[in-house]
């Protein structure tokens, strides 16, 4: 069974998948479509790296541009380094600028909805 066939079988169970499962899935060449990706739990999507989302979506990663104003895409973009977003070739803006440190202050983030940044 190839990655695409596997994805079709598990698609309906993905809604509540934790980050760890999504990371594992990104190694399976599943080419998840964007509509399914956007139904995933936001808290499960946010920790995924650009490379992991690229692998998870495959050719459908191109659609992030079309859906950049909607959650969880918008929130995920805000969490990524701009340099990493640039590798997607989509002209996505809003990532963390070069030279900034991301502090994982869970309480701060829970209150504000955005990561805490320290400038260069």
């Amino acid at each position: 069974m190839n990655g695409s066939e596997y994805f079709v079988k598990i698609q309906s169970f993905l809604g509540g998948a934790p980050t760890e499962d999504l990371k594992a899935l990104s190694q399976q060449n599943v080419s998840m479509d964007l509509a399914t990706f956007m139904k995933l739990r936001t808290d499960a999507v946010l920790p995924l790296t650009v490379a992991e989302v690229q692998k998870l979506l495959g050719p459908h990663v191109e659609g992030l541009k079309a859906e950049e104003r909607h959650r969880p895409v918008r929130d995920w973009i805000l969490r990524q380094r701009q340099d990493d977003l640039d590798t997607l070739g989509l002209g996505l803006q809003g990532g963390i600028p070069n030279g900034y440190l991301v502090l994982d202050l869970s309480m701060q983030e829970a209150l504000s909805g955005t990561p805490c940044l320290l400038g260069p």
Partner: antibody
């Protein structure tokens, strides 16, 4: 304004290969994915695949996996598609098309590939 | 693969008439989160390359005359030309961009009487 330049025609022999070019101008080449589409005379459109011009990552319609190879040259803002082991079934117009998000917002004029001995 | 079916395959209309063509997909093209339908319409005039008319099923591309109206959701879509002009003589294709391989309908050929 956005422009995609493609050669008008390519005449190739059966069994040979051909490398089609698509030179982009009028926009930032690495900010938009490129797609390739096949159209046989009097027939419909067939999606071949898409390529990320920033990383070179490419994805294919399974039907074209062993037929087509897409590449890009960022320095010249040019996308390429090589077609191999050509047969009469490969005689068609091949379009490059710049993505607008997912849809194909700008199309090149197309290259007519004729496979003939 | 998602199968796209267009109808009719051809039609002949007089200038000024209203025309509606149909496109059906074998599965939903609706993103239930964003409410966007992943469907585009293209026009291909004789001897030319296709041009984008409509994306997200109903969003008209910049510069496209407002007589071109996209509609529908889920699996059933339409392209309406509210008042056909002579320059609308062309083939019209729908395309899904929900899941690869992105697939096109067989096209509707519009002739002007």
């Amino acid at each position: 304004q956005v422009q995609l330049q493609q050669p008008g025609t390519e005449l190739v022999k059966p069994g040979a290969s051909v490398k089609l070019s698509c030179k982009a101008s009028g926009y930032t080449f690495t900010n938009y994915w490129m797609h390739w589409v096949k159209q046989r005379p009097g027939q419909g459109l067939e999606w071949i695949g898409n390529i990320n011009p920033s990383s070179g990552d490419s994805y294919y319609n399974e039907r074209f996996m062993s037929k087509a190879k897409m590449t890009v040259d960022k320095s010249s803002s040019t996308a390429y598609m090589q077609l191999s082991s050509l047969t009469s079934e490969d005689s068609a117009v091949y379009y490059c098309a710049r993505s607008g998000g997912l849809w194909l917002a700008f199309w090149g004029p197309g290259t007519l590939v004729t496979v003939s001995a | 693969d998602i199968v796209m079916t267009q109808s009719p395959s051809s039609l002949a209309m007089s200038v000024g008439q209203k025309v509606t063509m149909s496109c059906k997909s074998s599965q939903t093209l609706l993103n239930s989160v964003s409410q966007n339908n992943y469907l585009a319409w293209y026009q291909q005039k004789p001897g030319q390359s296709p041009t984008l008319l409509v994306y997200f099923a109903s969003t008209r591309e910049s510069g496209v005359p407002d007589r071109f109206i996209g509609g529908g959701s889920g699996t059933d879509f339409t392209l309406t030309i509210s008042s056909v002009q002579a320059e609308d003589l062309a083939d019209y294709f729908c395309q899904q961009h929900y899941r690869t391989p992105y697939t096109f309908g067989g096209g509707t050929n519009l002739e002007i009487k």
